[in-house]
């Protein structure tokens, strides 16, 4: 695959995560209940990180947020926090990428510049993907694990039933939600992946350049990597030879410092 | 915590007219359902009437007709008007609330209960 197409399709799986990621954070169903089925209507519960909404056997649904902070368990606190990192580190790895991408040309930004955003972008995804993951994981942990369940409060009174307050035993399922940012987690850290891969590409390869440029008087050798003598030249007139068709080049200019070519 | 305090109660003559009161408070993220039950001395305990937040009603065989459930979901309180009362009326009438206290923390909430005499 060509570098352009892993940067292109990274970005692509990427933005498609993220998409993902908001979506699940937005989402009200990161659980659900069959509350109770009473008398008079059957409830189903459905709770976000937001707000926590009720639909009636009718169809009518109340949804109500969050208002208070205080209230909330920590690993709530917890889970929004790591969403909300996950979104903005998505963010910045968007407008990273954009700027990074190889069909975009921008000014005179040059191939290394490009790679070193790539990457950063790519680093950026890999992170804000995680975070997603461990949130939606932590979450469904908190369900498994029982940890929302209350403990049942009995107050004495009238025909063992008056002033009584009872746990209503319900039965916890993963919502949509958490699907969703598992996925969308998954895809942003595959395109992050996939951003840094295509860094790779980008920069030089230094295996391709490892031409080192002994500046001797009146002489000059440049060695291919392995020890093959690739030129020698006695007098002064051995300038800009060729090693191979890649492009690297010896330069025996009167300069004693290395130039922009000379990989050692 | 959650609290439900009811109201209203008290001795009336058949035929007569009560009007009961159910106030739930605390900490409370939503009430699906609010219910009157009843419950005579030596009898089994059963549902008068009960409404949703979304007005849905169910009423018990024997006071559909005559009473008339109602609420206030803004309050978080639910009435009970009881018309053309009968002796067999008679009895202990508890408020039974069903509550989402918050993330996952559901409560079957009752009160303690009012008493309603039917008698000449």
């Known amino acids: 695959m060509s570098v352009t197409a892993c940067q292109g399709l990274g970005f692509v799986v990427s933005l498609i995560g993220f998409a993902g990621i908001i979506a699940a954070t937005c989402m009200d169903q990161w659980s659900t209940q069959d509350l109770y089925n009473n008398p008079v209507t059957a409830v189903f519960n459905y709770q976000g990180l937001w707000r926590s909404c009720v639909r009636e056997s009718s169809g009518f649904t109340e949804c109500r947020g969050y208002f208070t902070l205080l209230g909330l368990p920590a690993m709530l606190q917890a889970v929004r926090a790591l969403m909300i990192v996950g979104i903005v580190l998505g963010v910045i790895g968007i407008l990273v990428s954009i700027f990074a991408l190889k069909c975009i040309r921008i000014g005179s930004m040059d191939d290394s510049a490009k790679a070193k955003m790539t990457l950063t972008s790519g680093i950026l995804f890999i992170i804000s993907g995680i975070c997603a993951i461990i949130g939606v994981s932590v979450f469904a942990n908190m369900l498994v694990t029982n940890f929302w369940m209350s403990t049942a409060n009995m107050y004495s009174g009238m025909g063992g039933m008056g002033g009584m307050v009872q746990t209503v035993q319900t039965r916890y399922t993963f919502g949509a939600a958490l699907f969703v940012g598992w996925v969308a987690g998954g895809l942003t850290l595959i395109g992050g992946v996939m951003m840094c891969i295509a860094c790779r590409g980008l920069t030089p390869d230094d295996s391709n350049f490892k031409a080192v440029s002994y500046h001797a008087s009146g002489q000059n050798v440049a060695y291919r990597p392995g020890g093959f003598k690739a030129s020698t030249g006695f007098g002064s007139n051995t300038r800009n030879k060729k090693i191979y068709d890649g492009g690297a080049r010896t330069e025996d200019d009167e300069q004693s410092h290395p130039t922009k070519y000379d990989y050692v | 915590e959650v609290q439900v305090v009811e109201s209203g109660g008290g001795l009336v003559q058949p035929g007569g007219s009560l009007r009961l009161s159910c106030a739930a408070s605390?900490?409370?993220?939503?009430?699906?359902?609010m219910s009157w039950y009843r419950q005579a001395p030596g009898k089994q305990r059963e549902l008068v009437a009960g409404?949703?937040?979304?007005?849905?009603?169910n009423y018990g065989d024997s006071v559909k007709g005559r009473f008339t459930i109602s609420r206030d979901n803004a309050k978080n309180t639910v009435y009970l008007q009881m018309n053309s009362l009968k002796p067999e009326d008679t009895a202990a009438y508890y408020c039974?609330?069903?509550?989402?206290?918050?993330?996952?923390?559901?409560?079957?909430?009752w009160g303690q209960g009012t008493l309603v005499t039917v008698s000449s």
């Open positions: 605390g900490s409370i993220l939503h009430i699906p359902v």
């Open positions: 039974n609330v069903l509550v989402v206290s918050g993330i996952g923390s559901h409560l079957e909430v």
């Open positions: 409404i949703s937040t979304g007005g849905t009603t």
